[in-house]
Every structure is written in structure tokens, then in C-alpha cells.
Amino acid sequence: DASGDLLNTEAHSAPAQRWSMQVPAEVNAEAGDAAVLPCTFTHPHRHYDGPLTAIWRSGEPYAGPQVFRCTAAPGSELCQTALSLHGRFRLLGNPRRNDLSLRVERLALADSGRYFCRVEFTGDAHDRYESRHGVRLRVTAAAPRIVNISVLPGPAHAFRALCTAEGEPPPALAWSGPAPGNSSAALQGQGHGYQVTAELPALTRDGRYTCTAANSLGRAEASVYLFRFHGAPGTST
């Protein structure tokens, strides 16, 4: 396995022609982003138009757990997804055109590892091939970023504040504001993977409320202001 090479080309002999698979040695991406795992292949079955299955697995070739699988009916260029782990994997390539490239959405650090593509011809040309070396996906950590901060109406004419941040490792969120002691208790809930949301359930005073997100790579801040027209029937921000 020439892991230093930009491309791994794997092949075995077949009568007159060859199976081969081309995958990059490595793909790098940041947590929270998407990554494309390229995989193209050649095969000895010229003009094969029968049913086929495209598979991606993680961990180890041949035996690792499948993260994606789709099947294409005879003559069809549509590969119908049968499995997409957590709904984050989708085929970018067209297996009929020898392309099994896969897109992985909403990357987390735990997605780091080796991925292996496989194609199975399941018609008259009963044959299959799988990448032995695979492509290594390296997901790098991401500094915190506040993606949303807002004040919303709450019960009994009160207001609440929401702060959503993303980062990997997931950042810790803290609210600070004009309340005595300059900080307020926040309800923090785990969001989707790399996203975290914290709620300040009751804004008792006017002023500036600041959400701080921090992880091992850094910190981010964003503020929201609350001003109420006291005595007026319609309170506003």
C-alpha cells in the first residue's frame, strides 16, 4: 500500500482485460463540512448493462460494516439507495460510468478512518471487485462558530434566548448578561453531531446577552440585545 502516493490503483488479472479501482490515498476535511470520497473503476465486462450494486464500507475491506449501498436495475443509471448510515452518505458518481464516488455530509471526528468502495455485477456477468487499500478520510477538528443567536417570545410575556454553535469537539456554551453576577443559567442540549444549542429560558432584564462557545481550538462570541417598552401593551425587542 503506497500510502504516500496521491492515488492507489488496484487491479487483478482477468482473461484479456482487468478489474481495477482508483481511489486517492487520503481525503482531508474539517468537521461539520462535507467530503467527497472518489472511487472509479474499470472492469472486463464490456457493455455490461445488467443489475449492479455499489457498496461503501468502513474499517476494513470485505468485512467492515457497510455505510452505503445502492442498487441499479438493468439498463438504469439511477442507483437506488438501500442504505445510508445516519442519512449522511450519498452517491455522487454514476456506477454505469464506472464512478462510485461518495459524498459524506456533516462530518464528525468519529468519521475519520478508512473507507472501501465495492461494485457488484449481479446479472449474467456475475462478478465483483473491492478496493483493498481504500481511501483514508481524515476529519480535522474545527474551532467554534456561532451559527444562530436569537431572542424568542416565551410564556407569560417573557422572552428566551437561543444560541446554536458548531465545532469539533462540540463546544461548551455559556450565556452572560445584565443579570446580577453578569451570568445566567443556561439549558444546554446536544444538537446534531457537531452542533450544540443552549437556551436562556427567561430574560429578566433589558440589555446585552452574550453567548460564548469554546472548545480546545478556540472560542467565539455573539450578542443579542433586549429592549422592552415598559407599560406598552405590545412588548418588542
Partner: antibody
Framework: EVQLLESGGGLVQPGGSLRLSCAAS????????MSWVRQAPGKGLEWVST????????YYADSVKGRFTISRDNSKNTLYLQMNSLRAEDTAVYYC???????????????WGQGTMVTVSS | DIQMTQSPSSVSASVGDRVTITCRAS??????LAWYQQKPGKAPKLLIY???YIHSGVPSRFSGSGSGTDFTLTISSLQPEDFATYYC?????????FGQGTKLEIK
């Protein structure tokens, strides 16, 4: 626990029928091709039949073609082998086996049941 | 059908010995070969798949090699629990076929 448990074996007269079952647990049954492999007393292993993960395709050894039928119920995580027109040479321990890593191909059999004995004798 | 021929059919060895079992296919099967171990009254256990990949939980003293038509299973240092019958099996094409088996006995 990941396991396969066969049942349904027994003594049957030549020309008779039996239905073997294999209950799977501990893995996503529908994602894997499943097979039956048999072993006559004191002999080696013989592949009998394979069915794909979704049941789309079935394959048989020539020695059982037309007499045996493999099927699966993915809602019950169970594999079956219906054996008709049984002959003395079908006497064997029958194992169900799971394919490694694929719903269509059996690159290898990575999980085996304990086996169930089928004896065809008058 | 693809014929699989194992040799030897039986072998006697001692604990600590290095043992090699060979399997020959009647036609090119690429790397689609598996090795199994079977003990009396028990189901077979997968040792090696796709010619050279060691199945999880299998001791590293077992190794497989080869491609095309000639394959080898090697046990680098025999342990008492290794005395059993070993089978090769091709998964290149249906019907899947097994070798006749190699019985590994204590010398």
C-alpha cells in the same frame, strides 16, 4: 449475541420432505446473503444453496436443483430450506452460514450455525 | 465447476511446528479463497478470507497467501488447539466448492 440456530432436522424416508429453519440474531439479517452447506457423515463440506439478502436471487448445487428450495423471511430473521424428494445421499449435517460483508455475494462464510442432522433412510 | 484440491490430505506435526497446507484451483479464482478450521462434531470456523485476510479473533499465527490458482495456509507455530481438519473454499463463482480437507494430527 451474533448467532445462527438451525432446526427441523430428523429422520425421513426416501422420497419424503423436510423443512429446515435457521434463526438469526445479533446482526442485520437482510443485509447479508445466506447459504446452506452440508456435510455427510465422515465426509467433507458441500455447498448446497445461497439466497441474496433481499431474496432477489437463489442459487443451487446441481445435486439438489429442482428438489430443494431456499427462502428467507427478513421480518422474522429466518432462513429456510425446503427439501423434497429426499434421497439417501442427502443424509448429512446441514449448516446455515452467513456471508461476510455482502448482501449478494458470499466472499466467505463468517458465521455458522451448530448444524442439524438430516437422515434419509427406510 | 471449479475443483479445489488440497494437499496433503493429512499431516502429522508437533506443538511448535510450522505447518503449511496448500490448495489448488482448477482455474484462476483471483483471490476469492477462504480457509476454515473444523473440529469433530463442531461447525467450521472461518480463518482466512479473500486469500490473505485474517478473520477477527483468529490468532496471528495463521496466515494465508496466494492468488490465481495456488494458495497456502500457514500455521507458524502449532498450538494444541490447532489440531483439526482444514478446508479451503473458492467463492469466485457458483457453485461454491470446497477442498476435500486436510486433517492435522498430533505426531
Amino acid at each position: 449475541e451474533v448467532q445462527l440456530l438451525e432446526s427441523g432436522g430428523g429422520l425421513v424416508q426416501p422420497g419424503g420432505s423436510l423443512r429446515l429453519s435457521c434463526a438469526a440474531s445479533g446482526f442485520t439479517f437482510s443485509s447479508y446473503a445466506m447459504s446452506w452447506v452440508r456435510q455427510a457423515p465422515g465426509k467433507g463440506l458441500e455447498w448446497v444453496s445461497t439466497i441474496t439478502g433481499g431474496g432477489e436471487s437463489t442459487y443451487y448445487a446441481d445435486s439438489v436443483k429442482g428438489r430443494f428450495t431456499i427462502s428467507r423471511d427478513n421480518s422474522k430473521n429466518t432462513l429456510y430450506l425446503q427439501m423434497n424428494s429426499l434421497r439417501a445421499e442427502d443424509t448429512a449435517v446441514y449448516y446455515c452460514a452467513k456471508a461476510i460483508g455482502s448482501s449478494w455475494y458470499s466472499d466467505a462464510f463468517d458465521l455458522w450455525g451448530q448444524g442439524t442432522m438430516v437422515t434419509v433412510s427406510s | 465447476d471449479i475443483q479445489m484440491t488440497q494437499s496433503p490430505s493429512s499431516v502429522s506435526a508437533s506443538v511448535g511446528d510450522r505447518v503449511t497446507i496448500t490448495c489448488r484451483a482448477s482455474q484462476d479464482i483471483s483471490s476469492w479463497l477462504a480457509w476454515y478450521q473444523q473440529k469433530p462434531g463442531k461447525a467450521p470456523k472461518l480463518l482466512i478470507y479473500v486469500a490473505s485476510y485474517i478473520h477477527s479473533g483468529v490468532p496471528s499465527r495463521f496466515s494465508g497467501s496466494g492468488s490465481g490458482t495456488d494458495f497456502t495456509l500457514t500455521i507458524s507455530s502449532l498450538q494444541p488447539e490447532d489440531f483439526a481438519t482444514y478446508y479451503c473454499q473458492q467463492s469466485y463463482s457458483i457453485p461454491y466448492t470446497f477442498g476435500q480437507g486436510t486433517k492435522l494430527e498430533i505426531k
